[in-house]
């Protein structure tokens, strides 16, 4: 698994809706693959972490002044939807095919 | 200034192009305000950090399993351009009015 010493990458994160209290309105699935972005944004930032110019600048400043400025952070840069079965206001089970922004598609340094 | 204990916010970060080795091609300005996103993404995530659904989910999972899953990260969510004077291939000083993605406009939890 990607620890603090590894480079920014997408790792598995299985989320159980009961654990986060969302089982009260999400009927199914019981859990899903959310993924998590883990690892460091180390110099030099590789193309695969699609760094912004600001992230590149911050990385260079951190290199020069590590105690003053933090590294860029490994975060989701693109998200994917999941499909969920939920109860609407009337308690009717309803399928939402595209519940947006729930799962990581790509990670990057920002 | 925003430390680890404070909430995610935009803070000042003056960047000197000489410090990062970009003075070899950027003639002016000598330095600029890049800003930095600093602070924590604590539960509950406020509207002003414009959290994605994934960031909300990750925050809730972190609350339940703090050693297993990290918090969402405070990063630039919107960037602004700056204007720079640089030398082209012929050595001609040229103004780029919109050198995109160089300065933080907004921070958020991702």
């Amino acid at each position: 698994s990607a620890g603090a010493g590894s480079h920014c990458q997408k790792t598995s994160l299985r989320v159980n809706f009961e654990d986060i209290g969302w089982d009260s309105w999400i009927i199914a699935p019981k859990e899903y693959e959310a993924y998590e972005c883990k690892g460091g944004c180390f110099f030099p930032l590789a193309d695969d972490v699609t760094p912004t110019k600001h992230a590149i600048v911050q990385t260079l400043v951190h290199l020069k002044f590590p105690t003053k400025v933090g590294k860029a952070c490994c975060v989701p840069t693109k998200l994917s939807p999941i499909s969920v079965l939920y109860k609407d206001d009337m308690g009717v089970p309803t399928l939402k095919y595209h519940y947006e922004g729930m799962s990581v598609a790509e990670c990057g340094c920002r | 200034s925003a430390g680890a204990g404070s909430h995610c916010q935009k803070t000042s970060l003056r960047v000197n192009f000489e410090d990062i080795g970009w003075d070899s091609w950027i003639i002016a300005p000598k330095e600029y305000e890049a800003y930095e996103c600093k602070g924590g993404c604590f539960f509950p995530l406020a509207d002003d950090v414009t959290p994605t659904k994934h960031a909300i989910v990750q925050t809730l999972v972190h609350l339940k399993f703090p050693t297993k899953v990290g918090k969402a990260c405070c990063v630039p969510t919107k960037l602004s351009p700056i204007s720079v004077l640089y030398k082209d291939d012929m050595g001609v000083p040229t103004l780029k009015y919109h050198y995109e993605g160089m300065s933080v406009a907004e921070c958020g939890c991702r």
């Epitope: - | 300005p29 000598k30 204007s83 012929m90 001609v92 000083p93 040229t94």
Partner: antibody
């Protein structure tokens, strides 16, 4: 080596017309703003007009003193710059320099061509 | 239009001595942290040559004795040790706004 060579200058009567040309070499002509700058005998420098790039739709700007009388144009395929001067006045008498550069500076200069407006 | 005013109009300096030419703009020529100020040298019978750009940066092939300083409305061109080949007319020029305008020129001679 960058070269700008002006031609077309000469003696013309007030109210007359003249067309100046500038042949460029040694740089990618189409990448640079082009200008005309003039200098009356023994006097200072005066920017006359500029023409931008194809990506700017060849936008042009003129000094107030020549607007409506002078027209700047370029032919990137021929690496050439032109200045069509109509309704010439005695105060237009000057050396006309073709200059190339960026949106920031006059980087390249020709040797100039003399335009004399006199009756 | 931005008016550029140079001082003095003419200057006589001994060889090896320092020469200083000033230029004042009718309004600030700074924007985005950049000074839109250039200096040109014109020797007799020649076209102008870019000497200093962005207030303080030397043009290509310009000797180190030439330096520029200033910001906003007030700028200075300095020749640290005058050489015979520096006899010329010097012009300041702003490129912040169209029309790009020049100072009236300063004629530099040897005393």
């Amino acid at each position: 080596e960058v070269q700008l060579v002006e031609s077309g200058g000469g003696l013309v009567q007030p109210g007359g017309s003249l067309r100046l040309s500038c042949a460029a070499s040694g740089f990618t002509f189409s990448n640079y703003w082009m200008n005309w700058v003039r200098q009356a005998p023994g006097k200072g420098l005066e920017w006359v007009a500029h023409i931008r790039l194809k990506s700017d739709n060849y936008a042009t700007h003129y000094a107030e003193s020549v607007r409506g009388r002078f027209t700047i144009s370029r032919d990137d395929s021929k690496n050439s710059l032109y200045l069509q001067m109509n309704s010439l006045k005695t105060e237009d008498t000057a050396i006309y320099y073709c200059t190339g550069g960026s949106n920031y500076v006059f980087a390249f200069w020709g040797q100039g061509t003399l335009v004399t407006v006199s009756s | 239009d931005i008016v550029m005013t140079q001082s003095p109009d003419s200057l006589a300096v001994s060889l090896g001595e320092r020469a200083t030419i000033n230029c004042r703009a009718s309004e600030s020529v700074d924007n985005y942290g950049i000074s839109f100020m250039n200096w040109f040298q014109q020797k007799p019978g020649q076209p102008p040559k870019l000497l200093i750009y962005a207030a303080s940066n030397q043009g290509s092939g310009v000797p180190d004795r030439f330096s520029g300083s200033g910001s906003g409305t007030d700028f200075t061109l300095t020749i640290s040790s005058l050489q015979a080949e520096d006899v010329a007319v010097y012009f300041c020029q702003q490129s912040k706004e169209v029309p790009w305008t020049f100072g009236q020129g300063t004629k530099l001679e040897i005393k």
